[in-house]
């Protein structure tokens, strides 16, 4: 169940841990507190998950239903171009955002938004229901 590489997709997964929301074949954690991007990433990793990597527009649209105007960190960074934490490029944004500060990706009900990585925001973790299985 849910076996494969770290960046594979979950399949037929059972229920999620407490305070995690099951959607499709993944579990999602929407934080109440706020942290910077790196601290948010560490939080997710410590729980055998990862900052949210959105695999397609359908997942993005569905997740936005659960979001408000408050921005949440996701697993997206701009290092000479926008890339998800699984290494894949942000396919609907081919332009590198050249800024003097390191930029990371956030999301709210209105879509994606670039941000200075030091800003404290909510965050979203994503994982398979079992800790030692695929993250994406």
């Amino acid at each position: 169940l849910c076996q494969g590489s770290n960046y594979s997709t979950c399949a037929s997964c059972p229920s999620c841990p407490d305070r995690w929301m099951k959607y499709g074949n993944h579990c999602y954690y929407f934080s109440v507190e706020e942290k910077d991007w790196n601290s948010s990433l560490e939080f997710c990793l410590a729980r055998d998950s990862h900052l949210l990597v959105i695999t397609d527009n359908q997942e993005m649209s569905l997740l936005q239903v659960f979001l408000s105007e408050a921005f949440c960190w996701i697993g997206l960074r701009n290092n000479s171009g926008w890339r998800w934490e699984d290494g894949s490029p942000l396919n609907f944004s081919r332009i590198s955002s050249n800024s003097f500060v390191q930029t990371c990706g956030a999301i709210n009900k209105n879509g994606l938004q670039a941000s200075s990585c030091e800003v404290p925001l909510h965050w979203v973790c994503k994982k398979c229901p079992f800790a030692d299985q695929a993250l994406f």
Partner: antibody, heavy 116, light 108 residues
């Protein structure tokens, strides 16, 4: 580098509409919201509205009835339209990029005079 | 809406003088979302200090921002000729996003 270039008329007749195009470069409208702010001699800086990366818009309640903001991601253009202009709408209108937590880059401004 | 009041509206300072201007909000603003812009005549505003105390790129270290809650300030440790400009505070925490009326800093 990041740039926002505005184009639009300098003179608008009373009761007519104002249209401004903001063409951006150095960043993508799919990852950045664009705000509109105006600066008038009597009232200082006023936030007018925003178009978010996903295309949704939010407007200042004081302008919501006569303001429309739209965009074309593929052309990297944001469009601003305000209806029913009056003399007190005379101002410099700016498009501004959002990089959380702040609006960081401003267009050069479009100076608009409402007069017959 | 959050109203930002800047004081003084106009001030003059001698070269080398320490300058402080303030921005007071009608309700609490998160320090992350309180910013300062500088504007010179004929130019667009420029982000100068963001998140209360972080200097934007290229801003000289003689500038310092501080504050919390409803009270914020911008300080120049030693006034220089190029610092003459109008400074605006701005809150991006709550819509409608608002600006202060500005402090015009002149050379004495």
């Amino acid at each position: 580098q990041v740039q926002l270039k505005q184009s639009g008329p300098g003179l608008v007749q009373p009761s007519q509409s104002l249209s401004i195009t903001c063409t951006v470069s150095g960043f993508s409208l799919t990852t950045h919201a664009v705000h509109w702010v105006r600066q008038s001699p009597g009232k200082g800086l006023d936030w007018l509205g925003v178009i978010w990366s996903g295309g949704n818009t939010d407007y200042n309640a004081a302008f919501i009835s006569r303001l429309t903001i739209s965009k074309d991601n593929s052309k990297s253009q944001v469009f601003f339209k305000m209806n029913s202009l009056q003399a007190d709408d005379t101002a410099i209108y700016y498009c501004v990029r959002l990089l959380l937590p702040a609006m960081d880059y401003w267009g050069q401004g479009t100076s608009v005079t409402v007069s017959s | 809406q959050i109203v930002l009041t800047q004081s003084p509206a106009i001030m003059s300072a001698s070269l080398g003088e320490r300058v402080t201007m303030t921005c007071t909000a009608t309700s609490s603003v998160s320090s992350t979302y309180l910013h300062w812009y500088r504007q010179k005549p004929g130019s667009s505003p420029k982000l100068w200090i963001y998140s209360t105390s972080t200097l934007a790129s290229g801003v000289p270290v003689r500038f310092r921002g501080s504050g919390s809650g409803t009270s914020y300030s911008l300080t120049i440790s030693s006034m220089e000729a190029e610092d003459a400009a109008t400074y605006y505070c701005h809150q991006y925490r709550r819509s409608p996003y608002t600006f202060g009326g500005g402090t015009k800093l002149e050379i004495k």
